[in-house]
Interface confidence: low
């Protein structure tokens, strides 16, 4: 994921600040932390490894980068970082690692600025629907995030809600059409097995979309007619077994687009002869050279490139009549 | 193919320590969360412990909290569990587990297990 941002946004919160939502002492502008080590020339905050179980009351009003990473915060209430003066710099805020296993609604309220989240790495097992959206209006205020890094937040099987985790993911970023500027999204090492139909649509800005290492087994139904901005798709380390026509057509119409299939257990079968078509022809799949078939047996490993329409076949489906078993 | 060879168990005596390591291969070991589960006679398998991709966050049953510590060595694509002040409760198979998929789809891993009795 990208180092933090050192450019603060312009977009300031209109939202009036609850006495209860705010810490009751402003800190000393040159004031640090218990357990962080600050620099206000670099207009950071570290916060790392300390085993801290809340962010800290007295953050100095003049950090950009904040990283709280290698703790274990449990739980982001609501206005986790409200202060007076509100935190109007904060930019780039790294939570990763943790052990956060609940973002409430509203956790990132009042940072007018905030560009840059990662929360990967973090077990979040009830990320509430408006953690980004600070609201449950239809249409919330715009979010400044402009990068959102969520790699490896699915929790173990065991301590998951008795929901789709792919489902309580979406409804976070969909929340209130609050993300429409993301331009990065992570989304890698979460076991997705699908990917909702609606949420591409839906963040018409993103520029990289990263869907490494999940289970995606297919594409079918998801549509990138609408990100013509997009620059790079990760797919790599997948259950990817073929592309269809219908996405070929659609990736291949976008601009800008790199995209990114390694390592995925293509079948070389008949339902594949348009990939490999396009393969031959297409500029935007990076390392095109190294894919290579999984199944069947018979075709294993051999590279997609040098295919050709003779060896795509499809075995016969015999009646039932002449089935053996 | 993935593996998951755990060693370290044997008998020891109330209070005393052990040291449980779970070798891993066929897979990129830092790029996937582990955990520890235990199965006692008679009774359902139990997580015990379990740590990040890069050991920044930890998690452990309550009754083992304080007591156990378990920690990977990403270089040697080791897990490890450090047991101290052992009981005679703690007396069960150890299975060292991978998850590197949904578990409705098979795709988590475990070893053989390795036996650790507490007893005087």
């Known amino acids: 994921s990208s180092s933090p941002t050192s450019s603060a946004s312009s977009f300031s919160s209109s939202a009036p600040f609850l006495a209860s939502a705010v810490s009751a002492q402003p800190p000393l502008p040159d004031q640090c932390p218990a357990l962080c080590e600050c620099s206000e020339a670099a207009r950071t905050v570290k916060c790392v490894n300390r085993n801290l179980t809340e962010v800290p009351t007295d953050l100095p009003a003049y950090v950009r980068n904040l990283f709280l990473t290698g703790n274990q915060l449990a739980v982001l209430p609501a206005g986790a970082f409200a202060r007076r003066p509100p935190l109007a710099e904060l930019a780039a805020l790294n939570l990763s690692g943790s052990r956060l296993d609940e973002v409430r609604a509203g956790a990132f309220e009042h940072l007018p600025s905030l560009r840059q989240l990662d929360l990967s790495h973090n077990p979040l097992a009830d990320l509430s629907p408006f953690a980004f959206s600070g609201s449950n209006a239809s249409v919330s205020a715009p979010s400044p995030l402009v990068e959102l890094i969520l790699n490896h937040i699915v929790p173990p099987e065991d301590e998951r809600q008795n929901r789709s985790f792919e489902g309580m993911v979406v409804a976070a970023l969909l929340a209130g059409r609050a993300l429409q500027g993301l331009r990065r999204l992570e989304l890698a090492s979460n076991h997705f097995l699908y990917l909702p139909r609606d949420v591409l649509a839906q963040l018409p800005s993103l520029r990289h979309l990263d869907l490494s290492n999940n289970s995606l087994v297919s594409l079918t139904y998801v549509s990138f007619r609408n990100l013509t901005h997009l620059e790079s798709l990760h797919l790599e380390d997948n259950a990817l077994k073929v592309l269809h026509n219908g996405t070929l057509a659609e990736l291949q119409g976008l601009p800008h687009i790199r995209v990114f299939l390694d390592n995925n257990p293509w079948v070389c079968d008949c339902h594949m002869a348009d990939m490999v078509t396009w393969l031959k022809e297409t500029e935007v799949v990076q390392g095109k050279d190294r894919l290579t078939c999984a199944y069947p047996e018979k075709m294993r490993n051999r590279v997609l490139l040098e295919l050709n329409s003779a060896d795509l076949d499809c075995d016969p489906i015999l009646p039932p009549s002449l089935q053996t078993s | 193919e993935v593996q998951l060879v755990e060693s370290g168990g044997g008998l020891v005596q109330p209070g005393g320590s052990l040291r449980l390591s779970c070798a891993a291969s066929?897979?990129?070991?830092?790029?996937?969360?582990m955990s520890w589960y235990r199965q006692a006679p008679g009774k359902e398998r139990e997580l015990v412990a379990s740590i990040t991709t890069a050991g920044g966050s930890t998690r452990y049953a309550d009754s083992v909290k304080g007591r156990f510590t378990i920690s990977r060595d990403n270089a040697k694509n080791t897990l490890y569990l450090q047991m101290n002040s052992l009981r005679a409760e703690d007396t069960a198979v150890y299975y060292c587990?991978?998850?590197?998929?949904?578990?409705?789809?098979?795709?988590?891993?475990w070893g053989q297990g390795t036996l650790v009795t507490v007893s005087s």
């Open positions: 587990n991978a998850e590197l998929g949904p578990r409705r789809l098979g795709m988590d891993y």
């Open positions: 066929g897979f990129t070991f830092s790029s996937y969360a």
